[in-house]
Interface confidence: low
Amino acid sequence: PEPPTACREKQYLINSQCCSLCQPGQKLVSDCTEFTETECLPCGESEFLDTWNRETHCHQHKYCDPNLGLRVQQKGTSETDTICTCEEGWHCTSEACESCVLHRSCSPGFGVKQIATGVSDTICEPCPVGFFSNVSSAFEKCHPWTSCETKDLVVQQAGTNKTDVVCGPQDRLRA
């Protein structure tokens, strides 16, 4: 028969012959022949290959460098690379998460609109009228001003975006 010019999925062409690729987690040791199957070997410790392949060397797992604020989020297997993320309070500087920076805090007068994650920074928003934040925080939202009326009190000092209202007792008319 005519030698093949293309091979099926999970095969590759070598010496006019279709050989099976090695499955994920394994590397190629020797190509198939007319009489023998492709020979594959599992990747070693701290190595991986994530596709059907004919690689003769496995890839090294990514190193999550603690000096860059990185830690292992998901340990690599023979078929997957290690996934790094940032230590608590830090987030990745890029999608590849090769280094980390500290989450920013929202200043007084600003509240957290979206808490930072391992991959995105804190998003702050100005406290609108009726709300305040008196702390610098990476977690606190703007708090609503206290409602003096519900406590049967009156406003003695107006609130700002940084301070709560101050409530006091109702003025009593002397008899």
Partner: antibody
Framework: QVQLVESGGGVVQPGRSLRLSCAAS????????MHWVRQAPGKGLEWVAV????????YHADSVKGRFTISRDNSKNTLYLQMNSLRAEDTAVYYC???????????????????WGQGTTVTVSS | DIVMTQSPLSLPVTPGEPASISCRSS???????????LDWYLQKPGQSPQLLIY???NRASGVPDRFSGSGSGTDFTLKISRVEAEDVGVYYC?????????FGQGTKVEIK
């Protein structure tokens, strides 16, 4: 709503073949890994096979390896289990199940087999 | 393969009383990301299995808070704080750390 519906079960003689289907609806089928799990009459649950969301990775239990093949057609939102050389011990209710996940810190985390079909019965008997 | 062992295999319960099921794995299910890859499923009579708990202690959507999962490594427990009549069925633990997935033998919970 999110739903999985199996079909294709029936009575078949030993050595014959059968193809089970699992039709998915109510979610993005191509985003989820899928499993087949079976339950022999009066017995517990036995895992059969899993396939990755793109169909590139497949694993089968040793008890069915070389006889059963899991596959999927994302354009049809359907999961399949091709069962060849059937044996009496393959008699069971076959369930398909979705491998749930949730997005946390930009990564997908395992969330259990969160959706199951109603099951389809396969009886292998002469 | 990881072997999952449940106890007891049968559990008669009184409605309103607590119940507890144990599941032990032949190797640790604690992964390097800090999660225990263990699920609990309930199969009510004549129904498909349904997910109760994933990753050891996380309640699935819609599962009542009387169900809780605990444990780490190789020893896990499913607790029902106050059993209700609708909780009868067979409870299975399943390890999700490795392929092949493996289930416990099941614990049949029935009303006394």
């Amino acid at each position: 709503q999110v739903q999985l519906v199996e079909s294709g079960g029936g009575v078949v003689q030993p050595g014959r073949s059968l193809r089970l289907s699992c039709a998915a609806s109510g979610f993005t089928f191509s985003s989820y890994g899928m499993h087949w799990v079976r339950q022999a009459p009066g017995k517990g649950l036995e895992w059969v096979a899993v396939i990755s969301k793109d169909g590139g990775n497949k694993y089968h239990a040793d008890s069915v390896k070389g006889r059963f093949t899991i596959s999927r057609d994302n354009s049809k939102n359907t999961l399949y289990l091709q069962m060849n050389s059937l044996r009496a011990e393959d008699t069971a209710v076959y369930y398909c199940a979705r491998r749930g996940h949730q997005l946390v810190l930009g990564y997908y985390y395992y969330n259990g087999l969160d959706v199951w079909g109603q099951g389809t019965t396969v009886t292998v008997s002469s | 393969d990881i072997v999952m062992t449940q106890s007891p295999l049968s559990l008669p319960v009184t409605p309103g009383e607590p119940a507890s099921i144990s599941c032990r794995s032949s190797q640790s299910l604690l992964y390097s990301n800090g999660y225990n890859f263990l699920d609990w499923y309930l199969q009510k009579p004549g129904q498909s299995p349904q997910l109760l708990i994933y990753l050891g202690s996380n309640r699935a959507s819609g599962v009542p808070d009387r169900f809780s999962g605990s444990g780490s490594g190789t020893d896990f427990t499913l607790k029902i704080s106050r059993v209700e009549a609708e909780d009868v069925g067979v409870y299975y633990c399943m390890q999700a750390l490795q392929t092949p997935r493996t289930f416990g033998q099941g614990t049949k919970v029935e009303i006394k």
